[in-house]
């Protein structure tokens, strides 16, 4: 989902070329603005580069979408660990509490 | 294949303007920050201006803030310079040059395309 | 605003000898906003390097670029006939401007 920008613009030129999911670190889109009237897409590759992509791309508009699936999966994950973690420690405590009857 | 064509240089008095052209082909013009450089004669590289592919971003040089104006047309796929209150100072071969795929704030990718240069002399 | 220093002003070398040119920055530059442009007499600059150490298009890798901070380098390991030539470094600044170093003239011995 687009952010909104604080600054002015920072894409001078951008690119075309496809960019492969596995290469990429981040990917921030920012939304217009009254100091940017224009949608910037920003990507960080694993190995540091940043790179200005062409939001009307057909292959950025699909890599966006695969880099907003990829993003909500891992989230999903990590929100699935969490439970299971809770779940684990609720184990645990019912497991003390009934120690504590048994003595 | 990928092309700058420089026109509009020639020979004006002090104080007087001038706009130079440049015209792109073989790339999606508007896909690119473009630039103007130039090199008075026997003299090292000076960067003039620069605009970006939208025409959002755009930045001038000390030495011709308030008289140069840089400009383009995507829909002709040509860039512009246009140069008031000009001075002997300004006499150069003028350069116009494409910023490389992607360039930011954040990261420069150098100019990858340069034309040959449009030279103006300013004498009286 | 940055002002970029190159050296030697001119290197006097022969054709298979390594060249190295240093460019300084008057203060700190972030490495990924510097290049390196090679002209020739009577014709237009030629991209190098960008990002201080990555090679453009179809640039032979005889020519690399290092450095950080405020010091730079493009070295050319083995100079060829085609090498002998004016090498600026050229730095970009927020603003945004773009500053170019006065130019190290590579000459036959």
């Known amino acids: 989902t687009p952010v909104v920008r604080k600054g002015r613009c920072s894409c001078i030129s951008t690119n075309q070329g496809t960019i492969h999911l596995q290469s990429l670190k981040d990917l921030k889109q920012f939304a217009p603005s009254p100091s940017c009237e224009k949608i910037e897409i920003i990507a960080t590759l694993k190995n540091g580069v940043q790179t200005c992509l062409n939001p009307d791309s057909a292959d950025v508009k699909e890599l966006i979408k695969k880099w907003e699936k990829q993003v909500s999966q891992k989230k999903k994950q990590k929100n699935g660990k969490k439970h299971q973690k809770k779940k684990v420690l609720k184990v645990r405590k019912s497991q003390r509490s009934r120690q504590k009857k048994t003595t | 294949q990928v092309q700058l064509v420089e026109s509009g240089g020639g020979v004006v008095q002090p104080g007087r303007s001038l706009r130079l052209s440049c015209t792109a082909s073989?790339?999606?013009?508007?896909?690119?920050?473009m630039h103007w450089v130039r090199q008075a004669p026997g003299k090292g590289l000076e960067w003039v201006a620069v605009?970006?592919?939208?025409?959002?971003?755009?930045g001038y040089a000390d030495s011709v803030k308030g008289r140069f104006t840089i400009s383009r047309d995507n829909s002709k796929n040509t860039l512009y310079l246009q140069m008031n209150s000009l001075r002997a100072e300004d006499t150069a071969v003028y350069y116009c040059?494409?910023?490389?795929?992607?360039?930011?704030?954040?990261?420069?990718?150098?100019?990858?395309?340069w034309g040959q240069g449009t030279t103006v002399t300013v004498s009286s | 605003e940055i002002v970029l220093t190159q050296s030697p002003g001119t290197l006097s070398l022969s054709p298979g000898e390594r060249a190295t040119l240093s460019c300084r920055a008057s203060?700190?530059?972030?490495?990924?906003?510097l290049a390196w442009y090679q002209q020739k007499p009577g014709q237009a600059p030629r991209l190098l390097i960008y990002?201080?150490?990555s090679r453009a298009t179809g640039i032979p890798d005889r020519f690399s670029g290092s450095g950080s901070g405020t010091d730079f380098t493009l070295t050319i390991s083995r100079l060829e006939p085609e090498d002998f030539a004016v090498y600026y470094c050229?730095?970009?600044?927020?603003?945004?401007?773009?500053?170019f170093g006065p130019g190290t003239k590579v000459d036959i011995k």
């Open positions: 073989g790339f999606t013009f508007s896909d690119y920050g």
């Open positions: 990002g201080a150490s």
């Open positions: 605009i970006g592919y939208g025409g959002l971003i755009k």
């Open positions: 040059a494409r910023e490389g795929a992607g360039s930011s704030v954040y990261y420069y990718y150098g100019m990858d395309v």
């Open positions: 203060q700190s530059v972030s490495s990924s906003y």
């Open positions: 050229q730095q970009y600044g927020s603003s945004p401007i773009f500053t």
